[in-house]
């Protein structure tokens, strides 16, 4: 731990004659620097140099060739490595006065005349005299204001809002400062910070806008951190809203965004008078151009049962916002003519959900359905085939005599989706056909009986069974079945000798 540097002259304060020269020496165990009242531009007559000596200490000398009122103030010698942005300098101080009969008060910058008071806190009105002996009074519109005065700092007290003037008399001559404006600011011990980005997805050339709002607090320092910051990209604004309550709205605008502007946008607010910090972040993505992604929640071949209610849901990710439409067999769906409806809802900023709803599925609802999503940069579509599933039913069951040969063919026509399977059964003992055990399935490999199946169209099938010779009366059953159901019909085949036909339903 280094001991504090020391200053020569070893005094707390020193009065220096106007236009004379003075020098201050600082000794330290490490490299030392000076902080002094004037800014870089004003300090042309301040010279700082390092000096060698035999003590083993580091020595830095501050020299003023011609002292003026502006040189009045606090001179601090400190170790280089101890200086931080945030903290007050730790070091050794000496206060220099340079009395000037024509300049009663130390010259100030314009911003020094704005005195910000936080709620009912005390404040300093910084009118400092160039001479410690000069008597000073403080005035406002109501007259003299009682407040304690320190020539090194100014008037300290609790002040109401408004203008204040410091008055001094030097050798019978009266001096007045320009008005100091005391301005009250509201501050809270906690920071209420809200971030808003109306959009987080952009495309090249668009303007990114992010806002951070601080509520019920006026003593705030807010910093933005974002990808384009190092290149000087981004316009920052502060809007102060006073009604109905205090709100500071900080806006960051990045016009002509590029992909490189993608990333985290962060605002960090700090209570300027207290160590209260709050931070908010949003991730922004900038795309080279717009895009569309379609994600169906069903396959490319879908089935629906007759009279069923069914929804087909498609997720769409898109920017800019897409126009979404549905087609059936490449023609635009006319919803008011069918029991089919479509809708689109926005789920998130760039996420949409579109639904195709079948209210009561009909056979004619079968077909190819296409969802089309498009914006100015992209077009995407997804097509699926829909089949309305219909239970199988027998349309017709007839027989056909082959004349003198004694052969007979039975034809069974059935419909359904999916296409029904046709099975044949036979009952040889006509008297016992009421008993299910009397029926046997007709196998394909039976000699002198031929079975065949022909599909007529997408939903109709015809089955045939040909008996080479029918010698006695038998019953034939046609069984048509698919996933949704089965139907059967029976027919009596009479031997040609009996020349009689009977249909058993």
């Amino acid at each position: 731990q280094l001991s504090l540097p020391s200053i020569l002259p070893n005094e707390n304060e020193k009065v220096v004659q106007l236009n004379s020269s003075f020098s201050l020496r600082c000794f330290g165990e490490s490299e030392v620097s000076w902080q002094y009242p004037m800014s870089e531009e004003e300090s042309s007559d301040v010279e700082i140099r390092n000096e060698e000596n035999n003590s083993g200490l580091f020595v830095t000398v501050l020299e003023v060739s011609s002292a003026s009122a502006a040189h009045t103030g606090l001179y601090t010698c400190y170790y280089n490595h101890t200086q931080t942005e945030e903290n007050e300098l730790e070091g050794r101080h000496i206060y220099i006065y340079v009395p000037d009969p024509d300049v009663a008060f130390v010259p100030l910058g314009m911003t020094d005349y704005l005195v910000i008071v936080e709620d009912d806190d005390s404040a300093i009105i910084p009118c400092r005299t160039t001479d410690p002996e000069t008597p000073v009074t403080l005035h406002n519109s109501e007259g003299v204001v009682p407040a304690s005065y320190d020539s090194r700092q100014g008037f300290n007290g609790t002040f109401t809002v408004g203008p204040y003037i410091c008055e001094a008399t030097v050798k019978g001559k009266k001096f007045q400062t320009i008005p100091f404006n005391v301005y009250a600011l509201k501050a809270t011990s906690e920071l209420d910070l809200e971030m808003e980005a109306l959009k987080t997805v952009y495309k090249s050339g668009e303007t990114i806008v992010v806002t951070c709002a601080v509520f019920n607090n006026e003593v705030v320092d807010l910093q933005w951190t974002y990808p384009g910051e190092v290149k000087g990209k981004g316009i920052t604004m502060l809007e102060e809203i006073k009604v109905p309550s205090i709100k500071l709205v900080y806006t960051l605008t990045v016009p002509e965004a590029t992909v490189k502007d993608s990333g985290d946008y962060e605002c960090a607010a700090r209570q300027a008078t207290r160590e209260v910090k709050e931070m908010k972040k949003v991730t922004i993505s900038v795309h080279e151009k717009g895009f569309i992604e379609i994600k169906p929640t069903f396959s490319q071949l879908e089935a629906v049962n007759l009279h069923e209610v069914k929804h087909f849901v498609v997720e769409v990710r898109a920017y800019p916002p897409p126009r979404i439409s549905w087609l059936k067999n490449n023609l635009t769906l006319i919803e008011n003519l069918t029991e089919i409806t479509t809708d689109v809802e926005k789920i998130q900023e760039i996420r949409y959900r579109s639904k195709l709803k079948l209210i009561r599925a009909k056979e004619e609802d079968s077909g190819h359905y296409t969802i089309v999503a498009q914006n100015e940069d992209a077009v995407k579509s997804y097509t699926f085939e829909l089949l309305t599933q219909v239970p199988s039913s027998i349309l017709d069951l007839v027989d056909d005599h082959h004349g003198s040969t004694g052969g007979q063919t039975v034809r069974c026509t059935a419909e359904g989706t999916p296409l029904p399977d046709i099975e044949w059964m036979i009952c040889k003992d006509i008297k016992k056909c009421n008993n299910e055990t009397s029926w046997t399935i007709l196998a394909n490999n039976v000699s002198n009986i031929i079975t065949e199946i022909h599909s007529r169209d997408r939903s109709t099938v015809e089955g045939r069974v040909t008996f080479a010779k029918v010698e006695e009366t038998i019953a034939v059953r046609c069984l048509a079945k698919n996933l949704l159901g089965a139907e059967n019909r029976e027919l009596k085949l009479v031997a040609p000798t009996l020349r009689s036909e009977l249909t058993v339903a």
């Epitope: 806008v209 384009g228 809007e239 809203i241 709100k247």
Partner: antibody, heavy 122, light 107 residues
Framework: QVQLVQSGAEVKKPGASVKVSCKAS????????MHWVRQAPGQGLEWMGW????????NYAQKFQGRVTMTRDTSISTAYMELSRLRSDDTAVYYC???????????????WGQGTTVTVSS | DIQMTQSPSSLSASVGDRVTITCRAS??????LAWYQQKPGKVPKLLIY???TLQSGVPSRFSGSGSGTDFTLTISSLQPEDVATYYC?????????FGQGTKVEIK
């Protein structure tokens, strides 16, 4: 057509206040920020601040903080700028000017009032 | 605050000459810069915004360029009606600041 019409010239004593009005016409008043810029005799342009007519929110240059107040009356599409505790160096022409496109980031003061001369003299 | 420094502070050129005015920012301001023209006794007029975009109705002999800290306003062929003071102005952050102006006269 789009125009801003300001109130007439004013002569004030040091310490007094002045309130300058700026009436907008030919466009949606609440859709554009209004700025105030002043120009001392023979000098350049100096920005004072702006008001968002939609929210009433303001931003003042630090130099004028505590002395300037910008307000608006949306019912008559008028913006006001009041400067208090006047000094002789406040003598200038005060302009109101519309910001062409605040939220796009493509700023620029595209429509200006004719200016109001304020003279501060004892 | 961002300081804007214009050069030259005044210039005199002949009709038809190419005239260039420069403006330097004290820190990087990307292309957040506008140029104004103020004729004697008149109100300022916006010529260019976003460093190089011509405001509608402004003659094409005016052009702007630059990005970062160095910017230029060019009048390709000076006309008698171009006699004015030209100001650059940055809107990167508050307070908005103007250059001190460049006075253009005809020889």
């Amino acid at each position: 057509q789009v125009q801003l019409v300001q109130s007439g010239a004013e002569v004030k004593k040091p310490g007094a206040s002045v309130k300058v009005s700026c009436k907008a016409s030919g466009y949606t008043f609440t859709g554009y920020h209004m700025h105030w810029v002043r120009q001392a005799p023979g000098q350049g342009l100096e920005w004072m601040g702006w008001i968002n007519p939609n929210s009433g929110g303001t931003n003042y240059a630090q130099k004028f903080q505590g002395r300037v107040t910008m307000t608006r009356d949306t019912s008559i599409s008028t913006a006001y700028m009041e400067l208090s505790r006047l000094r002789s160096d406040d003598t200038a022409v005060y302009y109101c000017a519309r910001d062409r496109a605040f939220w796009s980031g493509y700023h620029g003061l595209d429509v200006w009032g004719q200016g109001t001369t304020v003279t501060v003299s004892s | 605050d961002i300081q804007m420094t214009q050069s030259p502070s005044s210039l005199s050129a002949s009709v038809g000459d190419r005239v260039t005015i420069t403006c330097r920012a004290s820190q990087v301001i990307a292309n957040y810069l506008a140029w104004y023209q103020q004729k004697p006794g008149k109100v300022p007029k916006l010529l260019i915004y976003a460093a190089s975009t011509l405001q509608s109705g402004v003659p094409s002999r005016f052009s702007g360029s630059g990005s970062g800290t160095d910017f230029t306003l060019t009048i390709s062929s000076l006309q008698p009606e171009d006699v004015a003071t030209y100001y650059c102005h940055t809107y990167k952050s508050a307070p908005w600041t103007f250059g001190q102006g460049t006075k253009v006269e005809i020889k």
